[in-house]
C-alpha cells in the first residue's frame, strides 16, 4: 500500500528575469526514492536518478539547475515559464509519487510600478 | 566507448532453449536498465524484456512470458536471457540496449541471430 | 497496450528536401517518445528521446515535437546518409511499443 505523500511549494510567484526554486518531498514512507523526473506540461526538464546523478534536458540546460536536494531551480524566468511543474517520484517498493506546482512569473516591471506608486 | 556485444544466438529447434549473453563495457553496468528487443527478419523492432540496474524488478512482452528470463550479473557486467520453448515466430535478431532514466534506449549492441527451425 | 502508428510506411525523397514523419499513439504518452534510425544489418541508433531532445552527437538537422499522442520527427535537409528506415517508441508503458516504420528512400 502506498502510504507516502508529497508536500511541495504549492502555487508560487516570481519576478521576470529572476530564479525560482521548486521543491518537493516526500514523507511518511520508507520506501526507495529511485528516481525523480521534473516535467512541465508534457516536456521533461530534468531527472535526478539514484545510480545515475543528473539528466537535464538540452532545451532547458542554460535556465535550469539541478539542486538543492532533488528540487529544480529555474533561472531567466520568462513569462512563458507560467504553468504547472510537476515532481513525479519513483519509488521502490510503492510505486509512483506525483507532486504538482503552479509558477506564476510577473513583468517585473509591473511588480515595480506596483509598488513604487501606491497611495500612502 | 560504452559497447555492447551479444552471443549465443544459433540454429534451434522448436520447443529448444537458448541462452544469450550480453556483454558490456565502457560504463558502470550496475547503474543502467538494460532491455532485449528483437527483429524479425524484413520486419520491425519489438520490445522483448527488461531489467532494472539491481535486477529488482522485470517485465516481459506478453509474447515471451513464462517462456523468456531475463536476468544480469553485475560482478561480470553481463545481462542474459534465457530462452524456453522457443518458436518459429521467436526467430529474429536480439538486441540488447542500455536505458538510462529508464526512459531512451541510448546504446544498442550488434545484435545475435537466433532461428527457430526443424 | 499502447498502439504507437507512423505514417507514412515509406516515402521517397530527394538530397536537401525537408523530410516529415509523423506518429501517433492510440493514449497521451506526455513526452515518452523516442525516435530511432536503423540502417540495414546494422543496430538502431537513438537520434531524438523524450519527444524533442536531441542525442548527442545527432546532427541538428533532426528535430521532434509533439506530446501527449502526436509526434513529428522532422529531418529539415535530407543528406546521403539519412536514407534509413525510422522507428518512433513509446516508453509511457510496458509493454514498450514501436511504431511500423517508416523507410526513407532516394527518390
Known amino acids: 500500500m502506498m502510504t507516502g505523500t508529497i508536500e511541495t511549494t504549492g502555487n508560487i510567484s516570481a519576478e521576470k528575469g529572476g530564479s525560482i526554486i521548486l521543491q518537493c518531498h516526500l514523507s511518511s514512507t520508507t520506501a526507495q526514492v529511485t528516481q525523480v523526473n521534473w516535467e512541465q506540461q508534457d516536456q521533461l526538464l530534468a531527472i535526478c536518478n539514484a545510480d545515475l546523478g543528473w539528466h537535464i534536458s538540452p532545451s532547458f540546460k542554460d535556465r535550469v539547475a539541478p539542486g538543492p536536494g532533488l528540487g529544480l531551480t529555474l533561472q531567466s524566468l520568462t513569462v512563458n515559464d507560467t504553468g504547472e511543474y510537476f515532481c513525479i517520484y519513483h519509488t521502490y517498493p510503492d510505486g509512483t509519487y506525483t507532486g504538482r506546482i503552479f509558477l506564476e512569473v510577473l513583468e517585473s516591471s509591473v511588480a515595480e510600478h506596483g509598488a513604487r506608486f501606491q497611495i500612502p | 566507448e560504452v559497447q555492447l556485444l551479444e552471443s549465443g544466438g544459433g540454429l534451434v529447434q522448436p520447443g529448444g532453449s537458448l541462452r544469450l549473453s550480453c556483454a558490456a563495457s565502457?560504463?558502470?553496468?550496475?547503474?543502467?536498465?538494460m532491455h532485449w528487443v528483437r527483429q524479425a527478419p524484413g520486419k520491425g523492432l519489438e520490445w522483448v524484456s527488461a531489467i532494472n540496474s539491481n535486477a529488482g524488478s522485470s517485465s516481459y512482452a506478453d509474447s515471451v512470458k513464462g517462456r523468456f528470463t531475463i536476468s544480469r550479473d553485475n560482478s561480470k557486467n553481463t545481462l542474459y536471457l534465457q530462452m524456453n520453448s522457443l518458436r518459429a515466430e521467436d526467430t529474429a535478431v536480439y538486441y540488447c540496449a542500455r536505458v538510462p532514466y529508464g526512459v531512451w534506449m541510448d546504446y544498442w549492441g550488434q545484435g545475435t541471430l537466433v532461428t527457430v527451425s526443424s | 497496450d499502447i498502439q504507437m502508428t507512423q505514417s507514412p510506411s515509406s516515402l521517397s525523397a530527394s538530397v536537401g528536401d525537408r523530410v516529415t514523419i509523423t506518429c501517433r499513439a492510440s493514449?497521451?504518452?506526455?513526452?515518452?517518445l523516442n525516435w530511432y534510425q536503423q540502417k540495414p544489418g546494422k543496430a538502431p541508433k537513438l537520434l531524438i528521446y523524450?519527444?524533442?531532445s536531441l542525442q548527442s552527437g545527432v546532427p541538428s538537422r533532426f528535430s521532434g515535437s509533439g506530446s501527449g499522442t502526436d509526434f513529428t520527427l522532422t529531418i529539415s535537409s535530407l543528406q546521403p546518409e539519412d536514407f534509413a528506415t525510422y522507428y518512433c517508441q513509446q516508453s509511457y508503458s510496458t509493454p514498450l511499443t514501436f511504431g511500423g516504420g517508416t523507410k526513407v528512400e532516394i527518390k
Open positions: 493514449q497521451s504518452i506526455s513526452y515518452y
Open positions: 565502457g560504463f558502470t553496468f550496475s547503474s543502467y536498465s
Open positions: 523524450a519527444a524533442s
